[in-house]
């Protein structure tokens, strides 16, 4: 019961996490503008992995997509790749984990197969979560680096043709969504891996067979002093586990002189 609960909870947590990773990837608020140095304070800039937007207090909003692929910063491309890999792995993990759920019966799937699938999905969730966390962290590092590099040059260059770096960006909501979602996916993956241990059978369960050499069951055969107490040669190579062995009542004994005493 605890295994099923752990597996089910791991699945739900991972599902929420992956939904969060997808949401974060699609969101435009990866970075938001700090407005302290603007003559028109009604302007708000925010940027995502796919487009840059401007919103004004008048209600005007405009977004422009990054249509070029080669011209974009390598960091942005890396973040995009990490997030997409995270989503793909997470989606595959979800698909695998659905079939691995103990509460869902599909044909005659054994627990060992379900355990393997649970472990596979768990690992996928862990990698997916790590990809998301890494992607968001790389982007956050890029923002911090840009912000501190720009602050020093903020007020220089009032002359003609002189440019001043005006990177006034701070962490957007998508970064926090991404971190939390990545963490949830990671936790869900760990839970799936823990559930896998409970699902996997430790050893093959042998049926208990009691053998004891009593006076009544010992047989003396000509040509050998061998007792047929079940320890004799297994001429038919019959499996003696999982129902193959005979119970105490079924052990065949040959008639001996003691039977007639």
């Amino acid at each position: 019961m605890a295994v099923t609960a752990c597996q089910g909870l791991g699945f739900v947590v991972s599902l929420i996490g992956i939904a969060g990773i997808i949401a974060a990837t699609c969101m435009d608020q990866w970075s938001t503008q700090d407005l302290y140095n603007n003559p028109v304070t009604a302007v708000f800039n925010y940027q995502g992995l796919w487009r840059s937007c401007v919103r004004e207090s008048s209600g005007f909003t405009e977004c422009r997509g990054y249509f070029t692929l080669l011209g974009l910063p390598a960091m942005l491309q890396a973040v995009r790749a990490l997030m997409i890999v995270g989503i793909v792995l997470g989606a595959i993990g979800l698909l695998v984990s659905i079939f691995a759920l103990k509460c869902i019966r599909i044909g005659s799937m054994e627990d060992s197969a379900k355990a393997n699938m649970t472990l596979t999905s768990g690992i996928m969730f862990i990698v997916s979560g790590l990809c998301a966390i890494a992607g968001v962290s790389v982007f956050a590092n890029m923002l911090v680096t840009n912000f501190w590099m720009s602050t020093a040059n903020m007020y220089t260059g009032m002359g003609g043709m002189v440019q001043t770096v005006q990177t006034r960006y701070t962490f957007g909501a998508a970064l926090f969504v991404g971190w939390v979602a990545g963490g949830l996916t990671l936790i869900g993956g760990v839970m799936m891996c823990i559930a896998c241990r409970g699902l996997a059978p430790e050893e093959t369960n042998y049926k208990a067979v009691s053998y004891h050499a009593s006076g009544h069951s010992v047989a003396y055969k000509p040509g050998g002093f061998k007792a047929s107490t079940g320890f004799g040669s297994n001429t038919k190579n019959k499996k003696i586990y999982d129902g193959g062995a005979r119970t105490e009542d079924e052990v065949q004994s040959y008639p001996s002189k003691h039977d007639y005493v």
Partner: nanobody, 122 residues
Framework: QVQLVESGGGLVQPGGSLRLSCAAS????????MGWYRQAPGKQRELVAV???????NYADSVKGRFTISRDNSKNTLYLQMNSLRAEDTAVYYC????????????????WGQGTLVTVSS
């Protein structure tokens, strides 16, 4: 390389009109706030007017009602229509643009033009 090129300056009589233009060129991704600033001889540079992408405007008190700022987002061009010019409007007018580049849309830059001289004299 991004360039802001101002044009339309010149000599005009008091009460006259002028229209300044500023064209931004280069690998620009998006221009946010654009503005006009001026610097009279021996004085600090001051804000004349600014405009956002959505056409929200802000004017210096000294030019309100006389100057009109406008822009064409598709052409990355800024305009300043100056009416009822006075002698105190004599200055070098600079174009200013807050923009980011296509090569790095996560960094914002402020670019300044070379300036165009407006002289109001009889």
């Amino acid at each position: 390389q991004v360039q802001l090129v101002e044009s339309g300056g010149g000599l005009v009589q008091p009460g006259g009109s002028l229209r300044l233009s500023c064209a931004a060129s280069g690998s620009i991704f998006m221009i946010n706030v654009m503005g006009w600033y001026r610097q009279a001889p021996g004085k600090q540079r001051e804000l004349v007017a600014v405009i956002t992408r959505g056409a929200s405007t802000n004017y210096a008190d000294s030019v309100k009602g006389r100057f009109t700022i406008s822009r064409d987002n598709s052409k990355n061009t800024l305009y300043l229509q100056m009416n009822s010019l006075r002698a105190e409007d004599t200055a070098v007018y600079y174009c200013n643009a807050d923009l980011n580049l296509a090569s790095d849309p996560f960094k914002w830059y402020t670019y300044w033009g070379q300036g165009t001289l407006v002289t109001v004299s009889s």
